[in-house]
């Protein structure tokens, strides 16, 4: 039967080395065997490149395309092929569809004055445009109480958050995760980082009396 795209490709760029496109076919498809996504930068002399998609689900395909360090002017021509049949054609401007890389190495350290210091790494090298543009969201949740969670917006430059132990339940196990976004690029949120877990051993003041 004929091959059809149900949901056309949606693409995002990490604005440093990779763009990812995802789309849904109208029936279960072996993406890597049946489809190819070609991409070409709209720039004089550019070559046509081919991405072999992988299955994310039965009918969902995803393609990861290596790109050069992105700049605002970059526009790619995208063509989705099933053999000789052109299924979809469109353009993609990475600077207009940014999904930042996931922050890394989230750690929790006890700090002075009954505070926890949460630290993570900025996923971009200092020379990249996004390095100084990221703000973060930190989610802290009680592992045993789904109602007990807090969300912190980190809008200052440093990838750190100081958390008063007294704001958390004593003796409870907590998990934290972090994600990033770039306001000036009107980006989407990054994926969440892996969680890190710790025991909040702060002793409330009343227990000392």
């Amino acid at each position: 039967g004929s091959v059809k795209v149900l949901h056309e490709p949606s693409c995002f760029s990490d604005y440093i080395s990779t763009s990812v496109c995802q789309w849904k076919m109208d029936h279960p498809t072996n993406c890597s065997a049946e489809l190819r996504l070609s991409y070409q930068l709209d720039f004089m002399g550019s070559e046509n490149h081919t991405c072999v998609p992988e299955n994310r689900e039965d009918s969902v395909c995803v393609c990861s395309m290596p790109i050069d360090d992105a700049v605002e002017a970059d526009v790619y021509q995208l063509d989705l092929w099933a053999g000789q049949q052109l299924l979809w054609s469109g353009s993609f401007q990475p600077s207009k569809h940014v999904k930042p890389r996931t922050p890394g190495n989230l750690t929790v350290h006890p700090n002075i004055s009954h505070t926890w210091l949460l630290m993570w790494t900025n996923p971009y090298p200092t020379e990249n445009h996004l390095h100084s543009e990221l703000t973060y969201m930190v989610n802290v949740s009680n592992d045993n109480d789904p109602e007990d969670f807090k969300v912190y917006n980190v809008t200052y430059m440093g990838p750190t958050l100081r958390l008063a132990a007294s704001t958390l339940k004593s003796g409870a196990s907590y998990s934290a995760r972090v994600r990033a976004w770039a306001q000036t690029y009107n980006s989407t949120w990054s994926d969440w980082s892996p969680s890190t877990t710790w025991l909040n051993y702060y002793e409330p003041w009343e227990q000392h009396l």
């Epitope: 720039f43 004089m44 002399g45 550019s46 070559e47 700049v71 002017a73 970059d74």
Partner: antibody, heavy 125, light 112 residues
């Protein structure tokens, strides 16, 4: 050492055809776009055409569009310019030159970083 | 099409002096910050052209540092300091950003 050697220039009548060749050595030919530039007697430089490294994309000056065809044979490290329906105003020295590196996603640009010695095309009755 | 305009069309300079050639484009040649697709070439009498400057300011291999390029957007300048007799020839600017590529009319440099 990078070398470009053009050949094929000749005296040809208006309406005639000619094929120029440019043999390259000393660099990875398939990784680079190649360009033809011409220079009419006593005049300035005029860009003619460009072809990317794979040969999949070509570009032409309006003055030659539809009459000239640029091509390449990467196995032979050779660039070609097929010139049809030649006119008196096509009389010029034709140079081939190495252009941008197109192997990367965004071509790496170094200008026209090496030129051949040129071959003379004369169109006259 | 992008039109390239060079000034002056001819220039006479004494050895040891500095020569400046201007090139203006009808559209911006800036693709991104630091990437201005403007080159300078020298054609010495009876020879093929040779590259001097690319991307507005980068010297081609083997080009002496007496040659320098500057500018961005639509206005560019080639400066030749401590001019030598060997610098005689016609200097061309060229835009390499989009098809059709285009050269300026050329500037003839004569050494007094």
């Amino acid at each position: 050492e990078v070398q470009l050697v053009e050949s094929g220039g000749d005296l040809v009548k208006p309406g005639g055809s000619l094929r120029l060749s440019c043999v390259a050595s000393g660099f990875t030919f398939r990784d680079y776009a190649m360009t033809w530039v011409r220079q009419a007697p006593g005049k300035g430089l005029q860009w003619v055409s460009l072809i990317n490294g794979s040969g999949g994309k070509t570009y032409y000056a309006d003055a030659v569009k539809g009459r000239f065809t640029i091509s390449r044979d990467n196995a032979k490290n050779t660039l070609y310019l097929q010139m049809n329906s030649l006119r008196a105003e096509d009389t010029a020295v034709y140079y081939c030159a190495v252009d941008r590196k197109t192997k990367t996603i965004r071509p790496q640009y170094y200008g026209l970083w090496h030129w051949g010695q040129g071959t003379l095309v004369t169109v006259s009755s | 099409d992008i039109v390239m305009t060079q000034t002056p069309l001819s220039l006479s300079v004494s050895p040891g002096e500095t020569a400046s050639i201007s090139c203006r484009s009808s559209q911006s040649l800036t693709y991104s910050i630091g990437y201005n697709y403007l080159d300078w070439y020298l054609q010495k009498p009876g020879q093929s052209p040779q590259g001097l400057i690319y991307l507005g300011h980068k010297r081609a291999s083997g080009v002496p540092d007496r040659f320098s390029g500057s500018g961005s957007g639509t206005d560019f300048t080639l400066r030749i300091s401590r001019v030598e007799a060997n610098d005689t020839g016609v200097y061309y600017c060229m835009q390499g950003l989009q098809s059709p590529l285009g050269f300026g009319q050329g500037t003839k440099l004569e050494i007094k």
